[in-house]
């Protein structure tokens, strides 16, 4: 069984989520990759994807999401800029490998976006918020639509574990087939 884990990011409106998803270089370098949100009780929804085949270090921008696939490093970089409270949720990277179902990359990202600057531990009350406007200069790629009724999977339950520290890791559940997920736009 595979241990499904997630890392929690607590950010403020206007900030940037900047994360990486590692993948096996030899196997997936040119495969199309996607960034998905998983809402409770729903299928994962693809928000952005790289081109097909995926181009090395070529930024793809969909709204406030920027994807960069570094083939030579075996990592997909995902940035969500100018975060909004509504961006809060559980996210994951997947690799498209038709005709097979998408392959999920670990770890998942639990994003919590809050308004303003509160006095929570590890943050600062008097910092000014950054609202950064990104120029729409990059490419938007079309994401494939996958349907696969036999892998309908509910999103994992929200963990009640204390995950306030950077090293926190939530062990959601032991799963076997959950790593293959269908994708809906």
């Amino acid at each position: 069984a595979t241990k499904l884990t997630e890392e929690k990011y607590e950010l403020k409106e206007g900030q940037t989520l900047d994360v990486k998803c590692d993948y096996t270089l030899e196997k997936f370098a040119s495969s199309q990759k996607a960034w998905q949100i998983i809402r409770d009780g729903e299928m994962p929804k693809t928000l952005a994807c790289t081109e097909r085949p995926s181009k090395n270090s070529h930024p793809v921008q969909v709204g406030r999401i920027i994807l960069e696939d570094y083939h030579d490093h075996g990592l997909l970089r995902v940035r969500m800029v100018n975060l909004q409270v509504e961006d809060s949720g559980l996210y994951q990277c997947v690799i498209y490998q038709p005709p097979k179902e998408p392959h999920m990359l670990f770890d998942r990202i639990r994003l919590v976006v809050t308004k303003g600057f509160s006095g929570t531990p590890g943050s600062n009350e008097n910092s000014t918020q950054n609202v950064y406007k990104i120029p729409p200069t990059t490419t938007k790629a079309l994401c494939p639509l996958y349907t696969s009724p036999r892998t309908v999977t509910q999103a994992p339950p929200k963990s009640t574990a204390d995950v306030s520290t950077p090293d926190s890791e939530i062990n959601l559940t032991n799963v076997t087939d959950i790593i293959r997920v269908p994708v809906f736009n």
Epitope: Q15, V81, S127, P166
Partner: antibody, heavy 121, light 105 residues
Framework: QVQLVQSGAEVKKPGASVKVSCKAS????????IHWVRQAPGQGLEWMGW????????NYAQKFQGRVTMTRDTSISTAYMELSRLRSDDTAVYYC??????????????WGQGTLVTVSS | SYELTQPPSVSVSPGQTASITCSGD??????VGWYQQKPGQSPVLVIY???KRPSGIPERFSGSKSGNTATLTISGTQAMDEADYYC????????FGGGTKLTVL
């Protein structure tokens, strides 16, 4: 607790190679990138590259391409940085550092104590 | 190649506020970290994700960002804060600013 312990100081002649080790403890070695940063006397921090201990893959700063090799031995949770064709301006303290999280490349929350490498004829 | 620009030096009187800036292209899209380094010691992370403090870092250290400029602010500066400070960001590669020497007069 997380610890990165580096090998001792080295004195090398120009043209030689040096291999610095960084032994990790207190966490799952495969889960976090290890970076190498150097600092010449009186100078700032200079990033040399990162190592993905899980895959063994590395990413080197352009300046060091062709001269640096980063490897690891997962059985002993140790990362290595080898710099070849040493010159006098490679004299510096070399640090290994660990990512704060598994899903980010920066910042570096944990640092080794540093290894002084002196290149002198 | 990507560069982060810091002032070489900043001076402040004890108890006053010190501000160190770091600017770079598209820094608004990137998370900024700040490190403190005292002579003969390894760097210490004092701010990450623009404005968060790791545990153990005093509250007088704060970070902010406006557009493409990040700022490290030390309020009520103490003699022990005298050190070199470096900003850091991830472009295609990891980049450090040139460093700022903070002198507490």
């Amino acid at each position: 607790q997380v610890q990165l312990v580096q090998s001792g100081a080295e004195v090398k002649k120009p043209g030689a190679s040096v291999k610095v080790s960084c032994k990790a403890s207190g966490y799952t070695f495969n889960g976090y990138y290890i970076h190498w940063v150097r600092q010449a006397p009186g100078q700032g921090l200079e990033w040399m590259g990162w190592l993905n201990p899980n895959s063994g893959g590395a990413n080197y700063a352009q300046k060091f391409q062709g001269r640096v090799t980063m490897t690891r031995d997962t059985s002993i949770s140790t990362a290595y940085m080898e710099l070849s064709r040493l010159r006098s301006d490679d004299t510096a303290v070399y640090y290994c550092a660990r990512d704060q999280r598994k899903t980010t490349v920066t910042p570096f929350e944990y640092w080794g104590q540093g290894t002084l490498v002196t290149v002198s004829s | 190649s990507y560069e982060l620009t810091q002032p070489p030096s900043v001076s402040v009187s004890p108890g006053q506020t010190a501000s160190i800036t770091c600017s770079g292209d598209k820094l608004g899209e990137r998370n900024v970290g700040w490190y403190q380094q005292k002579p003969g010691q390894s760097p210490v992370l004092v701010i990450y994700q623009d404005n968060k403090r790791p545990s153990g870092i005093p509250e007088r250290f704060s970070g902010s960002k406006s557009g493409n400029t990040a700022t490290l602010t030390i309020s009520g500066t103490q003699a022990m804060d005298e050190a070199d400070y470096y900003c850091q960001a991830w472009d295609r590669n990891v980049v450090f600013g040139g460093g700022t020497k903070l002198t507490v007069l």
